[in-house]
Interface confidence: medium
């Protein structure tokens, strides 16, 4: 479904950005962002600039990198405002100023704006060959650019669900975009996957007052249970995958198993009690009766108490326009703890190690 987005990026702070290739006039681009639940993006801070930089560098878009491209952003000069040659923004201002993070982005003007005090003007971000930000360019608001940038702000996020034995993960974000990977998921995101035996499973990121959680998934549980004993980065693996180049054991034990006395393998728990509490119940072709369950368990993880400790990961995603989500199965809910910080960022208390590497995904779903 349209409006389509070529790429999107989310950060742990709760801000998401999307880049769109479409020849819209300024106002139509603003409305396109609003129709998705966002706004035309500002780029008035270092963190926003970094997010936009990653979006652009992810690929040139339809033009194939053959020409410079212009993207609408939320930068304009009102009729009553004069050109200010000595100001970084030349008298232009952002439509949605951010008082907490308002330092100017490190971009020049590719051309000096015309001197005027009586005409409303808009500005676009010019990208060399469509991938490298060159700077701002004054534009008449009724002209069309090659694309536009949207921004979405969420108060809380869900950490990435742990796949276990799941494959074909598909995330449908609330701004109507699909991806096969998403480290930070805004409320409303739906994730679906296939479990072994052609079983489909799905869950939705649910927002409550001060937290967000995956509907029916207890913190730390996996989407699909492992047939074996070992988990590495939330995925089912075999023992050889658990030993690093020094021979150290780097895995977790799957449900029903515990670390053996040797510290390098997992053994069956002596008194394992299977519980259905907080499970995800896979269903064959979405409608059949439950055929398997994930049991509730916890493991050591990292808790981030200080805002500075939370890795500000930005993830770049290639988006398709089709949703492949099956029906959502509603099961008991729990809440991973989400803590707001003075800076307005979101700190998630993960039950497993949070993602700290940049994920780059070029597949369309």
């Amino acid at each position: 479904e349209h409006p389509t987005a070529d790429r999107a990026a989310c950060s742990a702070s709760g801000a998401c950005y999307s880049l769109h290739h479409a020849t819209f006039k300024r106002r139509a681009a603003e409305e396109a962002c609003s129709l998705r639940g966002g706004t035309l993006s500002t780029v008035h801070s270092g963190s926003e600039f970094q997010a936009v930089l990653l979006l652009l560098r992810a690929g040139p878009g339809p033009g194939g990198g053959s020409k410079d491209l212009l993207f609408w952003v939320a930068l304009e000069r009102s009729i009553s405002q004069c050109t200010q040659e000595k100001e970084p923004l030349r008298g232009f201002s952002w439509l949605h100023p951010d008082s907490e993070d308002s330092e100017d982005s490190p971009l020049p003007w590719v051309e000096e704006p015309q001197r005027s005090c009586t005409v409303r003007k808009c500005a676009a971000l010019q990208a060399t060959r469509g991938v490298e930000p060159a700077g701002w360019k004054e534009m008449r608001c009724h002209l069309r650019t090659d694309g536009y940038l949207c921004k979405y702000q969420f108060e809380v996020l869900c950490p990435a669900p742990r796949p276990g034995a799941a494959s074909n993960l598909s995330f449908q974000a609330p701004f109507r975009l699909s991806s096969s990977a998403l480290d930070f998921s805004p409320p409303g995101t739906e994730v679906s996957a296939m479990c072994p035996g052609d079983l489909s499973v799905s869950s939705t990121c649910i927002q409550e007052e001060t937290s967000a959680h995956w509907d029916g998934l207890f913190p730390g549980t996996v989407l699909c249970p492992c047939s074996g004993r070992y988990l590495l980065a939330g995925k089912c693996v075999e023992l050889p995958d658990c030993l690093d180049h020094l021979g150290d054991f780097t895995c977790e034990c799957a449900v029903g198993f515990e670390l053996g006395k040797d510290g390098r393998s997992c053994e069956t728990k002596v008194e394992e009690q299977l519980t259905l509490e907080g499970t995800k119940l896979p269903t064959r072709n979405v409608t059949a009766t439950p055929a398997g369950a994930v049991t509730n368990r916890t493991w050591p993880g990292q808790v981030y108490d200080k805002p500075g400790e939370m890795p500000q990961v930005t993830e770049i995603l290639q988006w398709g326009t089709q949703s492949t989500l099956p029906t959502i199965q509603k099961t008991p809910q729990t809440k991973p703890k989400v803590t707001g910080t003075p800076s307005g960022s979101v700190v998630l208390n993960y039950t497993s190690s949070p993602p700290v590497s940049l994920t780059f995904d070029t597949s369309s779903t």
């Epitope: 479904e1 349209h2 409006p3 389509t4 479409a22 020849t23 819209f24 006039k25 106002r27 139509a28 603003e30 409305e31 396109a32 609003s34 129709l35 998705r36 639940g37 009724h142």
Partner: antibody, heavy 117, light 108 residues
Framework: EVQLQQSGTVLARPGASVKMSCKAS????????MHWVKQRPGQGLEWIGA????????SYNQKFKGKAKLTAVTSTSTAYMELSSLTNEDSAVFYC????????????WGQGTSVTV | QIVLTQSPAIMSASLGERVTMTCTAS???????LHWYQQKPGSSPKLWIY???NLASGVPARFSGSGSGTSYSLTISSMEAEDAATYYC?????????FGGGTKLEIK
């Protein structure tokens, strides 16, 4: 002068489909989003969705996905909405509307198409 | 989605009386994206106030709008007969666009 002229009253059977039109004049049809709004008798307004005729981008209210389909023909500056699998819940007046001068408010409205199922 | 609740649902006022109706949003709405429409029976809605406080073309100066966050209001300083109508608030801060249930203003 901006005008939106909608097609006339429709009487339809349950389960059938109807397609109504909205002909625009007085502005550049391809440059503005066209919205559709539903109003049941004696009730309030519900946003159905919007189409950008310049490239046929659409956005729907989740509630109306599968019920309404929006299209546009630029050569005649006409937007269309097709409603399928009609029930008595679809009996309503449907308006086409768009913003032109004011910030994302719906400045101009058609006279409405009445559908009775 | 953002739910807009208008109150009262129905009100009556005497000519010359000051009238205020409110619109409460379920979550915060930017004042730029809160609008009011007037609708009379058998007619299409008309844009009446846009971006919280700006009067649309042709709207009498006795009308005013104010508010921020989750609380907005439309005020008529001195009720006139032609003001009898239903007024809807409308937000475009979050998709889908939503309307309030309306306030029907009658002459007492």
């Amino acid at each position: 002068e901006v005008q939106l002229q909608q097609s006339g009253t429709v009487l339809a059977r349950p389960g059938a489909s109807v397609k109504m039109s909205c002909k625009a004049s007085g502005y550049t049809f391809t440059s503005y989003w066209m919205h559709w709004v539903k109003q049941r008798p004696g009730q309030g307004l519900e946003w159905i969705g919007a189409i950008y005729p310049g490239n046929s981008d659409t956005s729907y209210n989740q509630k109306f996905k599968g019920k309404a389909k929006l299209t546009a023909v630029t050569s005649t500056s006409t937007a269309y909405m097709e409603l399928s699998s009609l029930t008595n819940e679809d009996s309503a007046v449907f308006y086409c509307t768009h913003y032109y001068g004011s910030d994302y408010a719906m400045d101009y409205w058609g006279q409405g198409t009445s559908v009775t199922v | 989605q953002i739910v807009l609740t208008q109150s009262p649902a129905i009100m009556s006022a005497s000519l010359g009386e000051r009238v205020t109706m409110t619109c409460t949003a379920s979550s915060s709405v930017s004042s730029s994206y809160l609008h009011w429409y007037q609708q009379k029976p058998g007619s299409s809605p008309k844009l009446w106030i846009y971006s919280t406080s700006n009067l649309a073309s042709g709207v009498p100066a006795r009308f005013s709008g104010s508010g921020s966050g989750t609380s907005y209001s439309l005020t008529i300083s001195s009720m006139e007969a032609e003001d009898a109508a239903t007024y809807y608030c409308h937000q475009y801060h979050r998709s889908p666009r939503t309307f309030g249930g309306g306030t029907k203003l009658e002459i007492k």
